[in-house]
């Protein structure tokens, strides 16, 4: 994968894709974050590895994306969950899996859900399971707004760059 | 569907939507491909039919999309799978379904997974099943990069223009 | 806007690519609609509440989005379905859930499916269920085209702004 076996600075350079010159007026804020695979029981977003990036003003603060300038953004996220069969001795309890992108804005004193997906899974004997959730939509956001995620079922996440991600771009 | 019952050239014309102007600097490469429904045991991408198109430099080579110019692209794909119940005499074995968008770049000597979705299906008696997978995200790509897909469960694809597709557009 | 204030020949040139002529270059048609939670057995789209909006020429007509100007649009929609376990006295019949974005243009005497997702659900005893469907793609659309949705399983929709939505934006 990008940067594998490179020094951090070389890996960074390896991700600097050749780009077209843009006048300031056509800056296109964009971000693509991936779930940190080294953190198994939490979902920490990273932009400094693999195919992830922060461009034209996006930044990461307290595991949230900070909106660089007011406007309309397409915001998206995906998670993939997996699990093993339950052991015959254990009780099979249903698993509630959910993933949500939330907005925290100075306008509201709470997190507003923007995108929500949900699933109930009933693990069976000898039956490993896999489930993917994706969502994305356009939202009017304000400079300084914070975009974050909330996930139920974090221990079941399949943490890889192509399965668990979170991003946004200005329209 | 668009162009049905038309000659190839008339069908082509039928897809020429009235369009607006851009200076060359603001060309917007975009592509939307659909799975060829006449190929039942493979997934062949087509751009010359129905609602599919290649615009402003995108091209198709060896079933891959060729990135026309370096920059950030939103890349997406969907598949829908279906299956019948297993016969009482047959053993019901779990089915692993997966769909992945991959990047092949001169930078790396292998296919890099960009987007992956997965599902385990356990066919039951008298129980036909259906499953949809969608994913999309923003990636920094380089001119000449090749975007392709890999699918597990191809014989189960529901091949229609609205269910199985693959596309990208420059941001 | 296309051709505004241009000579006929310049206006002609101005239509070679799907984009607005950049006199009003900052026009970016976009729409995000949410399912009206007060209408439990139908799916009525609203743009005048919560995070929903219509921008730069998008409009509603008979529960459809009207395309404001010819060009390429990214169109997306999501639904979330839920259901309770069936009662032991009742027969558990399979539920067919589907969600489709359709294009109506009098070019064709029917609605053309653009995006389709489908699922079969088999409710079990004591087993509440939840299922999410999302899809989106880029399409060449014409001014005045009508984008609508068709859903199987409407009584099972989880109607909230973050779970059931429909939108589009010009590329």
């Amino acid at each position: 994968l990008p940067g594998v076996g490179l020094t951090p600075s070389a890996a960074q350079t390896a991700r600097q894709h050749p780009k077209m010159h843009l006048a300031h007026s056509t800056l296109k804020p964009a971000a693509h974050l991936i779930g940190d695979p080294s953190k198994q029981n939490s979902l920490l977003w990273r932009a400094n590895t693999d195919r992830a990036f922060l461009q034209d003003g996006f930044s990461l603060s307290n595991n949230s994306l900070l909106v660089p300038t007011s406007g309309i953004y397409f915001v998206y996220s995906q998670v993939v969950f997996s699990g093993k069969a339950y052991s015959p001795k254990a009780t099979s309890s249903p698993l509630y899996l959910a993933h949500e992108v939330q907005l925290f804005s100075s306008q509201y004193p709470f997190h507003v859900p923007l995108l929500s997906s949900q699933k109930m899974v009933y693990p069976g004997l000898q039956e490993p399971w896999l489930h993917s959730m994706y969502h994305g939509a356009a939202f009017q956001l304000t400079q300084g707004d914070q975009l974050s995620t909330h996930t139920d079922g974090i221990p079941h996440l399949v943490l890889s760059p192509s399965t668990v991600f979170f991003g946004a771009f200005a329209l | 569907l668009p162009g049905v019952g038309l000659t190839p050239s008339a069908a082509q014309t039928a897809r020429q939507h009235p369009k607006m102007h851009l200076a060359h600097s603001t060309l917007k490469p975009a592509a939307h491909l659909i799975g060829d429904p006449s190929k039942q045991n493979s997934l062949l991408w087509r751009a010359n039919t129905d609602r599919a198109f290649l615009q402003d430099g995108f091209s198709l080579s060896n079933n891959s999309l060729l990135v026309p110019t370096s920059g950030i692209y939103f890349v997406y794909s969907q598949v829908v799978f279906s299956g019948k119940a297993y016969s009482p005499k047959a053993t019901s074995s779990p089915l692993y379904l997966a769909h992945e968008v991959q990047l092949f770049s001169s930078q790396y000597p292998f296919h890099v997974p960009l987007l992956s979705s997965q599902k385990m299906v356990y066919p039951g008696l008298q129980e036909p099943w259906l499953h949809s997978m969608y994913h999309g995200a923003a990636f920094q790509l380089t001119q000449g990069d090749q975007l392709s897909t890999h699918t597990d469960g191809i014989p189960h694809l529901v091949l229609s223009p609205s269910t199985v597709f693959f596309g990208a557009f420059a941001l | 806007l296309p051709g505004v204030g241009l000579t006929p020949s310049a206006a002609q040139t101005a239509r070679q690519h799907p984009k607005m002529h950049l006199a009003h270059s900052t026009l970016k048609p976009a729409a995000h609609l949410i399912g009206d939670p007060s209408k439990q057995n139908s799916l009525l789209w609203r743009a005048n509440t919560d995070r929903a909006f219509l921008q730069d020429g998008f409009s509603l007509s008979n529960n459809s989005l009207l395309v404001p100007t010819s060009g390429i649009y990214f169109v997306y929609s999501q639904v979330v379905f839920s259901g309770k376990a069936y009662s032991p006295k009742a027969t558990s019949s399979p539920l067919y859930l589907a969600h489709e974005v359709q294009l109506f243009s009098s070019q064709y005497p029917f609605h053309v499916p653009l995006l389709s997702s489908q699922k079969m659900v088999y409710p079990g005893l004591q087993e509440p269920w939840l299922h999410s469907m999302y899809h989106g793609a880029a399409f060449q659309l014409t001014q005045g085209d009508q984008l609508s949705t068709h859903t199987d399983g409407i009584p099972h929709l989880v109607l909230s702004p973050s779970t059931v939505f429909f939108g589009a934006f010009a590329l």
């Epitope: - | 939507h17 009235p18 369009k19 607006m20 | 806007l1 296309p2 051709g3 505004v4 006929p8 206006a11 002609q12 239509r15 009003h24 026009l27 048609p29 743009a47 005048n48 509440t49 929903a52 909006f53 219509l54 921008q55 730069d56 020429g57 409009s59 509603l60 007509s61 008979n62 009207l66 395309v67 404001p68 100007t69 010819s70 243009s105 009098s106 070019q107 014409t142 001014q143 005045g144 085209d145 009508q146």
Partner: antibody, heavy 118, light 107 residues
Framework: EVQLVESGGGLVQPGGSLRLSCAAS????????IHWVRQAPGKGLEWVGY????????NYNEKFKGRATISSDKSKNTAYLQMNSLRAEDTAVYYC???????????WGQGTLVTVSS | DIQMTQSPSSLSASVGDRVTITCRAS??????VAWYQQKPGKAPKLQIY???HRYTGVPSRFSGSGSGTDFTLTISSLQPEDFATYYC?????????FGQGTKVEIK
């Protein structure tokens, strides 16, 4: 320069029909819809409907559905409004208009007066 | 259908005056409102779209504001050529209804 010229107005008997024409020039006819809007004497504006000459797509104000038909002829760069079962209250100046974005009526014809009277 | 109620129905003002016309929608229409100017015997002219954006060639003395249900057209300093009838229009959903008009007359 975008130009729209309506014709076909005049005196019509109640219960009769009218067919108005709108000749368009100065732009590519198939790139934009043509709207029809009417205005009764001394009254406000009322949208009738539109036709897209590219694909013959139409959309009507429910009030006029079944009585109005909007069409176009690409070869003549002309749009038409046909109205049937005319009544006195259909007396109005009828305008055709070309939008920029769909609902913004940016270019207008000069209007043609239709009088429904016996 | 959405009703658009304009006020006042007419007003008298002098050159140089600041004039404000309001329009109220019967339900929230986001910012999907346009304003037109019409002179006697002429077709209407688009002035403002998306509630607050001036159309090409419209003088800067014209401005629009509002969202939801309440919208305003303001002429900051009335000029002789501004005496006309002004219409608001909702473009949130068809049939894209117009207000009944506000006639701006010379005092």
């Amino acid at each position: 320069e975008v130009q729209l010229v309506e014709s076909g107005g005049g005196l019509v008997q109640p219960g009769g029909s009218l067919r108005l024409s709108c000749a368009a020039s100065g732009y590519t006819f198939t790139s934009y819809v043509i709207h029809w809007v009417r205005q009764a004497p001394g009254k406000g504006l009322e949208w009738v409907g539109y036709n897209n000459p590219y694909n013959d797509g139409t959309n009507y104000n429910e009030k006029f559905k079944g009585r109005a038909t909007i069409s176009s002829d690409k070869s003549k760069n002309t749009a038409y409004l046909q109205m049937n079962s005319l009544r006195a209250e259909d007396t109005a100046v009828y305008y055709c208009s070309r939008p920029t974005m769909l609902p913004w009526f940016a270019y207008w014809g000069q209007g043609t007066l239709v009088t429904v009277s016996s | 259908d959405i009703q658009m109620t304009q006020s006042p129905s007419s007003l008298s003002a002098s050159v140089g005056d600041r004039v404000t016309i309001t329009c109220r929608a019967s339900q929230a229409v986001s910012s999907a409102v346009a304003w037109y100017q019409q002179k006697p015997g002429k077709a209407p002219k688009l002035q403002i779209y998306s509630a607050s954006h001036r159309y090409t060639g419209v003088p800067s003395r014209f401005s629009g504001s509002g969202s939801g249900t309440d919208f305003t057209l303001t002429i900051s300093s009335l000029q002789p050529e501004d005496f006309a009838t002004y219409y608001c229009q909702e473009v949130y959903s068809t049939p894209w209804t117009f207000g009944q008009g506000t006639k701006v007359e010379i005092k």
